[in-house]
Amino acid sequence: WQVRCPPTWGQVQPRDVPRSWGHGSSLALEPLEAEVRKQRDSCQLVLVESIPQDLPFAAGSLSAQPLGQAWLQLLDTAQESVHVASYYWSLTGPDIGVNDSSSQLGEALLQKLQQLLGRNISLAVATSSPTLARKSTDLQVLAARGAQVRRVPMGRLTRGVLHSKFWVVDGRHIYMGSANMDWRSLTQVKELGAVIYNCSHLAQDLEKTFQTYWVLGVPKAVLPKTWPQNFSSHINRFQPFQGLFDGVPTTAYFSASPPALCPQGRTPDLEALLAVMGSAQEFIYASVMEYFPTTRFSHPRRYWPVLDNALRAAAFSKGVRVRLLVSCGLNTDPTMFPYLRSLQALSNPAANVSVDVKVFIVPVGNHSNIPFSRVNHSKFMVTEKAAYIGTSNWSEDYFSSTTGVGLVVTQSPGAQPAGATVQEQLRQLFERDWSSRYAVGLDGQAPGQDCVWQG
């Protein structure tokens, strides 16, 4: 379980000099201090989540570190650079015409980012075109203070969006998960992600994915037929990173979508998901906002049963216990429910086929003034062998035309006295949600599927 030697820094991140990555698209970033570069990795992975206000779980329930706290801590550690990929930015209440005290954490984060820029820490942002929150001024404010911002025209390039949500800090620390740069992600939407500290191997590998966005964010950029060698990854499902995370033997790798943005050596996100499902022998628990065995935003809709078939095959052929927790909110597309019922219909306990589907409803309560909120936005899966934390919903577009990243982690059980493996922690978080009063069986839903909390 030795940590492998890092690739040379210059291959990974153009920090030493502003360096061309095609189309004159270099990130002009400060050189890292030699001491920082030489530090040994002592990787640490922390699960982070947002629990919406007024969503109490049973007393004594497990919880992960609050996302807002983790983000502020990450920014506190930044010394050189922060690179952020996010579908959209909306860190202030006025962005969406809302005056609500729950936006304060997002506004504090925006403030903190401005302070970083004031301390000469570089901020590079890759965001999507098309995007949501088009009235948001966050990026104008940050750009005016020196942030480098690129809108990646995924609509033109792949007919998708940039849906990834991750940070790379100082080429050493990582956040990735379901949360966009949105104040609602901190207080009004249920999110799940991971922060990895002091892990330059993985951080520099994820940086390569950031760089694929960065080079596509210049005017008139085109998708390369073959990505240049310096974008290639040596960390993938066949050669995962191996190291000690807090003393626990761990393997990990990042996957990416769509395939057109997977340079040589990068495991496509769909392949990673299918591999994790395929290796499960006891259970597959998945929590995703949306589940459609179809295309999602393209016309005409097309049937796409890849993930659906994999879940069915695991349950039917291997006796794997499948649980799928899907979100149900005011902005949920009701055409999803027949597909969920179809999947659950496979369940046949007498034949040892176990498929259970529930919907998770976040009560709106007195937060009805906040649009596109009060929803479980998580995208993760856990088996007895691995944890998968992603940024994609489960429908074709997210794997064929839209950008996303996944993190696959496996830890060896029993090696550490102090705590559970990542997959065990994630399983416990899933089971907390699954057994909570907010998780409702499909038969407990009204025929209209209006996703309103009935209490």
Partner: antibody, heavy 124, light 107 residues
């Protein structure tokens, strides 16, 4: 099949209020869309007037802000336009339409269903 | 407000022709543009959304393109049923705004 149908008086006197109803069938107005009024002036110019959202919130064209109100009756699946202090300049064909879909994460919004329109003449 | 301009208010073409209708925005609308068809009887139909995406049920002879401030709708093989007025509309910001329309007739 989703259908929208406008109704209301075809003739309104200047300085009075114009009131129209849009009746929606085949879809609940409390779901997933902005329920919108758009008018077309003689000569074809289209003007977006405003909407009532699935959640009951409103947004209006600033050019009409002091005169316009859009409300709804969810029990009848109808939404309404009220335009105060009309002048002859408000003579137009008034259409209701839905804009969306407002699903999580969807950045593509459009008016995918339109009513046939109702002509309103403002004249004394 | 963003002004949308369709400089050609009417045009006539022969059956089978390739017809292009253009639309210009007063500022960059980042591809947030839709096209509608209004038939002589007044019925309005969505054709294309987000610059180039064909809406369900729309014949493939319709296509859209453009970026920044300049956009166009193309009908590749004009048919009699395409006689109509075509409008562009931006959804980049509120208020939504429409072009003045281009009336298409058959020669």
């Amino acid at each position: 099949d989703v259908q929208l149908q406008e109704s209301g008086p075809g003739l309104v006197k200047p300085s009075q209020s114009l009131s129209l109803t849009c009746s929606v069938t085949g879809y609940s107005i409390t779901s997933h869309y902005y329920w919108t009024w758009i008018r077309q002036f003689p000569g074809n110019k289209l003007e977006w007037m405003g909407y009532i959202s699935y959640d009951g919130s409103n947004n209006y064209n600033p050019s009409l802000k002091n005169r316009i109100s859009i409300t709804r009756d969810t029990s009848k699946n109808q939404f309404f336009l009220k335009l105060n202090s009309v002048t002859t300049e408000d003579t137009a064909t008034y259409n209701c339409a839905r804009e969306g879909p407002l699903y999580y994460g969807n950045p593509y919004w459009y008016f995918d269903v339109w009513g046939a329109g109702t002509t309103v003449t403002v004249s004394s | 407000d963003i002004q949308m301009t369709q400089t050609t208010s009417s045009l006539s073409a022969s059956l089978g022709d390739r017809v292009t209708i253009s639309c210009r925005a007063s500022q960059d609308i980042d591809n947030y543009l839709n096209w509608y068809q209004q038939k002589p009887d007044g019925t309005v139909k969505l054709l294309i959304y987000y610059t180039s995406r064909l809406h369900s049920g729309v014949p493939s002879r319709f296509s859209g393109s453009g970026s920044g401030t300049d956009y166009s709708l193309t009908i590749s093989n004009l048919e009699q049923e395409d006689v109509a007025t075509y409008f562009c509309q931006q959804f980049n910001t509120l208020p939504r705004t429409f072009g003045g329309g281009t009336k298409l007739e058959i020669k």
